[in-house]
Amino acid sequence: VTCDDYYYGFGCNKFCRPRDDFFGHYACDQNGNKTCMEGWMGPECNRAICRQGCSPKHGSCKLPGDCRCQYGWQGLYCDKCIPHPGCVHGICNEPWQCLCETNWGGQLCDKDLNYCGTHQPCLNGGTCSNTGPDKYQCSCPEGYSGPNCEI
C-alpha cells in the first residue's frame, strides 16, 4: 500500500507535512515523525540552536548559529560582562562593575594608589611615600628640596 503525500504508517493515518515557519522547522522521517531541520530543536522544532559555545545563561538566538547577548554582556559567546562605563584599570564579574586591579582605586579605578612605583617622581635620591590616590610625598636627602627634590 502506498500512502498519499504526507501520510505514513499502517493504515496511512499518520500525518506529517514539512514546515519551515513560525510553527516549526521540520521534515518528516519514513515513519512520519517530525525531524528538526539542521539548527533547530525542541518538540515543535521552533527553538534555534545557537552558536557552539554561546553562553546558555547570557546569550540566546532566534536564528541557528547566532548568539545575541543579554544586556550587560558581550563577546562572541556572550560570556564577558561589560564593565561600568569609563572603568579604566578595573574588571567585572557581573555587568557594570568596576573591580580595581592592584594599586588602583576610585569608582572608575582611575586613581593611582602606587604613584611612587608607577611614576618614581622623587629625584636626587629622594624617598617616595604614597599618601593617597594620585598623591605622594618626597623626603629629600640633605641639600635637596622641592616637591620632587629637584631643587
Epitope: F15, F22, N46, R47
Partner: antibody, heavy 116, light 107 residues
Framework: QVQLVQSGAELKKPGASVKVSCKVS????????IHWIRQAPGQGLEWMGI????????KYNQKFKDRVTMTVDKSTSTAYMELSSLRSEDTAVYYC?????????WGQGTLVTVSS | DIQMTQSPSSLSASVGDRVTITCRTS??????LTWYQQKPGKAPKLLIY???TLASGVPSRFSGSGSGTDFTLTISSLQPEDFATYYC?????????FGGGTKLEIK
C-alpha cells in the same frame, strides 16, 4: 501531570484593560507555545493568538491585533494575555491552551465581564 | 482568513446511533484539522488531531477522516456522555479558526 491554572474572574468597566495569567506546571514551559482562545456566553470558540514561550514572539488574530498583548515570564512559567479598550462584547471566558498538534491541555478558563 | 463551515449546527440523536458531523474549509488545509468536544461550563477536550489521529484517552468510537477541504467526525455508537457540543478547528495558518459548533442533543 500537565496543568494550566488561570487567574480568577474579573469585572471591568468599558475602556479598561484586563490581564489574565496562565501558570503552567508538569512540563518544560519553554518547550510549547501557548494559545489564547475566548468564548462569549452561549457562543463558539474564537482563537486570539499564540506566543512562543521561549522567545516571547507572538502572532495575533488581526481582529485583536491592536488591543491584545501576550507575554511570558519564564522565571515563573506563566503566560499573560492583556486586552485593552474593553467593550461589552469582550465579555467572555478566556482560555489558555498548550499548542502542539491540537490543544490537548487547557486552562480552566477566566470569566471576564465588561459592564458599566 | 480560512473559513470553517460546520454542519449541522444542531443534531438530535439517540444512544447507540451513528452520528456524523462535517467541517468544510474555504481552502486546502491538508490535514491540519482538530476536533474538540465541549460540555457546559468546561474547557474543550481534544478528540482528534491531524484530521484522523485519535487523542490519548479518547474512546475508539470516535473517528476522523478527510483531508484538503472536507472533513468528518464520526461517533459510531452514541453513549450518554457524548451529548455535548463539537467544534472543528484548523491549525494550518494564522489565524487558526474554529467552526461554529455542532450541538448534539438527546432525541
Amino acid at each position: 501531570q500537565v496543568q494550566l491554572v488561570q487567574s480568577g474572574a474579573e469585572l471591568k468597566k468599558p475602556g479598561a484593560s484586563v490581564k489574565v495569567s496562565c501558570k503552567v506546571s508538569g512540563y518544560a514551559f519553554t518547550d510549547y507555545a501557548i494559545h489564547w482562545i475566548r468564548q462569549a456566553p452561549g457562543q463558539g470558540l474564537e482563537w486570539m493568538g499564540i506566543i512562543n514561550t521561549y522567545y516571547g514572539d507572538s502572532k495575533y488574530n488581526q481582529k485583536f491585533k491592536d488591543r491584545v498583548t501576550m507575554t511570558v515570564d519564564k522565571s515563573t512559567s506563566t503566560a499573560y494575555m492583556e486586552l485593552s479598550s474593553l467593550r461589552s462584547e469582550d465579555t467572555a471566558v478566556y482560555y489558555c491552551a498548550r499548542g502542539y498538534d491540537g490543544f490537548a491541555y487547557w486552562g480552566q478558563g477566566t470569566l471576564v465581564t465588561v459592564s458599566s | 482568513d480560512i473559513q470553517m463551515t460546520q454542519s449541522p449546527s444542531s443534531l438530535s440523536a439517540s444512544v447507540g446511533d451513528r452520528v456524523t458531523i462535517t467541517c468544510r474549509t474555504s481552502e486546502n488545509i491538508y490535514s491540519y484539522l482538530t476536533w474538540y468536544q465541549q460540555k457546559p461550563g468546561k474547557a474543550p477536550k481534544l478528540l482528534i488531531y491531524n484530521a484522523k489521529t485519535l487523542a490519548s484517552g479518547v474512546p475508539s468510537r470516535f473517528s476522523g477522516s478527510g483531508s484538503g477541504t472536507d472533513f468528518t467526525l464520526t461517533i459510531s455508537s452514541l453513549q450518554p456522555e457524548d451529548f455535548a457540543t463539537y467544534y472543528c478547528q484548523h491549525h494550518y495558518d494564522i489565524p487558526w479558526t474554529f467552526g461554529g459548533g455542532t450541538k448534539l442533543e438527546i432525541k
